[in-house]
Interface confidence: medium
């Protein structure tokens, strides 16, 4: 997420070929430009080795955590719920993104030495990770809404439908990340190390803005509204019916959603502000431009950190995950079977109770 860089970017190079009179970055200001403030592009100054260490830590945590999550879900074939399938895909998305982090880390030190193909692939995986994440969480919210508010098990009973939804999510995520695949490339220059960034050439401003607004709308705002609607009604139903057990069972899902929003909402709000400024809804000033650039740097790290946080949530809040993990360790003789909790069940995220399936 280009510019996301969405960052992204998340869509980074939106100024090429546009009238730059409103944002004149001036190294030294001649007398006739005294009315225009001197302005150079700025971003946070962070030591590149610190960035590499962060990447390495997130990579190791994400690789270990998400591999374990996938292992536990795949082991518990018997009581696997719909939510489990979504969480399995969520872990897969995080794992795929984590695998790109060593490449980003290496590029921080040596520049982008991996060529355009890898530039496109690793950038795509970052975007797909974000979009699939929010779309899967939206699907979980719909599933919980149907199960708790409408007491229906339609989705739960039709496993093929869940698989189709997951495949559709991956397909839609790829579609939303397509601008990155199209425009990201390795740019070679005599003055700087090779760089992997969004080079949109001389496309018209409208076309470029459309490619930024569409993914932001359909990939972030729409799923966010779905989640707010579904969880709003789900919470209302739980509180009205005093469903203590089910409320506890929803803790992990709420934690997952909350962490996702805390990690990705700031970055996407900054990206939205950036888009509004580029479309001149908000007036562009040098100060605002640089504030946004610094804010993109400050908030993007939260999105990167997110890929290793879900397993920690399951480990600390999800009782069933802990039990499932201990069960696998016991099966392989890594721990004594006596140390297994008495209520340890084969399901990763829960047992069916009435018309709902409790989670984690």
């Amino acid at each position: 997420m280009e510019d996301f860089n969405m960052e992204s970017d998340s869509f980074e190079d939106f100024w090429k070929g546009e009238d730059l009179s409103n944002y004149s970055y001036s190294s030294t200001l001649p007398p006739f430009l005294l009315d225009a403030a001197p302005c150079e592009p700025e971003s946070l100054e962070i030591n590149k080795y610190f960035v590499v260490i962060i990447y390495a830590l997130v990579f190791l945590l994400s690789l270990l955590g998400n591999s374990l999550v996938m292992l536990v879900i795949l082991y518990s074939r018997v009581g696997r719920s719909v939510t489990d399938v979504y969480l399995l895909n969520l872990a897969l998305a995080d794992l795929l993104f984590a695998l790109t982090l060593p490449i980003w880390a290496a590029s921080k030190v040596n520049g982008w030495i991996f060529g355009t193909f890898l530039c496109k692939v690793v950038s795509l995986l970052k975007e797909v990770n974000f979009y699939s994440g929010i779309l899967l969480l939206a699907c979980i919210s719909v599933d919980r809404y149907l199960a708790i508010v409408h007491a229906t098990r339609t989705l739960t009973q039709k496993r093929y439908l869940v698989k189709f939804i997951c495949l559709s999510i991956w397909g839609l995520s790829l579609l939303l990340a397509l601008p990155v695949l199209l425009f990201r490339r390795t740019v070679y220059s005599s003055n700087v190390s090779p760089a992997c960034y969004e080079d949109m050439g001389n496309n018209t401003a409208n076309w470029r803005m459309l490619l930024r607004i569409l993914p932001q709308s359909f990939g972030f705002i729409v799923p966010l509204l779905i989640m707010l609607f579904c969880y709003g009604f789900t919470l209302r139903t739980l509180f009205k019916a005093h469903m203590g057990q089910k409320h506890r069972a929803m803790r992990v899902i709420f934690a997952v959603v909350l962490i996702f929003l805390l990690c990705w909402l700031p970055y996407n709000l900054v990206l939205l502000a950036d888009t509004l400024m580029r479309t001149q809804v908000i007036q562009e000033t040098c100060e605002r431009r640089n504030h946004i650039d610094r804010a993109l740097d400050a908030t993007e790290i939260l999105g990167i950190l997110h890929s290793c946080l879900n397993p920690l949530i399951y480990a600390f809040i999800g009782q069933k995950f802990r039990h499932g993990l201990l069960k696998i360790l016991a099966i392989h003789g890594l721990i004594s079977k006596d140390s297994l909790p008495k209520d340890s069940r084969p399901s990763f995220v829960g047992s069916s109770s009435g018309h709902t399936s409790t989670t984690l």
Epitope: E2, D3, N5, E7, S8, D9, S10, E12, D13, W15, K16, G17, E18, L20, S21, Y23, S24, Y25, S26, S27, C39, E40, P41, E42, S43, L44, I46, V51, W104, K126, V187, S189, N191, V192, A195, C196, Y197, E198, D199, D293, L296, D297, E300, I301, I304
Partner: nanobody, 126 residues
Framework: EVQLLESGGGLVQPGGSLRLSCAAS????????MGWYRQAPGKQRELVAD???????NYADSVKGRFTISRDNSKNTVYLQMNSLRPEDTAVYYC????????????????????WGQGTLVTVSS
């Protein structure tokens, strides 16, 4: 940090010639347009000539046929060859460049900036 360094200005007699050069340095990804502007005392700034990365050239009517702009993309340098100089060409000549630079800690983002040099004085007088 990007810097534009001009050179070649000075005192010249009417009908004489001068060659201005402007070199861009720093973390530059690409330079889109490079050009020369001038400002005579008490007058507004005006475009003298500019040249795109593709080689498209634009001249002010007052200098057509006398001035020639050229650039060396490999050296990030723009030149202005000034022939048949007139007293009315006396001004401070500023180098201007539309430069793409990279910003960003985690993911690199391209930003295009309009950079200016400090100026070089050209005096045409007998």
């Amino acid at each position: 940090e990007v810097q534009l360094l001009e050179s070649g200005g000075g005192l010249v007699q009417p009908g004489g010639s001068l060659r201005l050069s402007c070199a861009a340095s720093g973390s530059i990804v690409r330079i889109n347009t490079m050009g020369w502007y001038r400002q005579a005392p008490g007058k507004q700034r005006e475009l003298v000539a500019d040249i795109t990365s593709g080689g498209n050239i634009n001249y002010a009517d007052s200098v057509k046929g006398r001035f020639t702009i050229s650039r060396d993309n490999s050296k990030n340098t723009v030149y202005l060859q000034m022939n048949s100089l007139r007293p009315e060409d006396t001004a401070v000549y500023y180098c201007n460049a539309e430069i793409v630079v990279l910003v960003g800690v985690w993911t690199q983002r391209a930003r295009t900036g309009n950079y200016w040099g400090q100026g070089t004085l050209v005096t045409v007088s007998s």
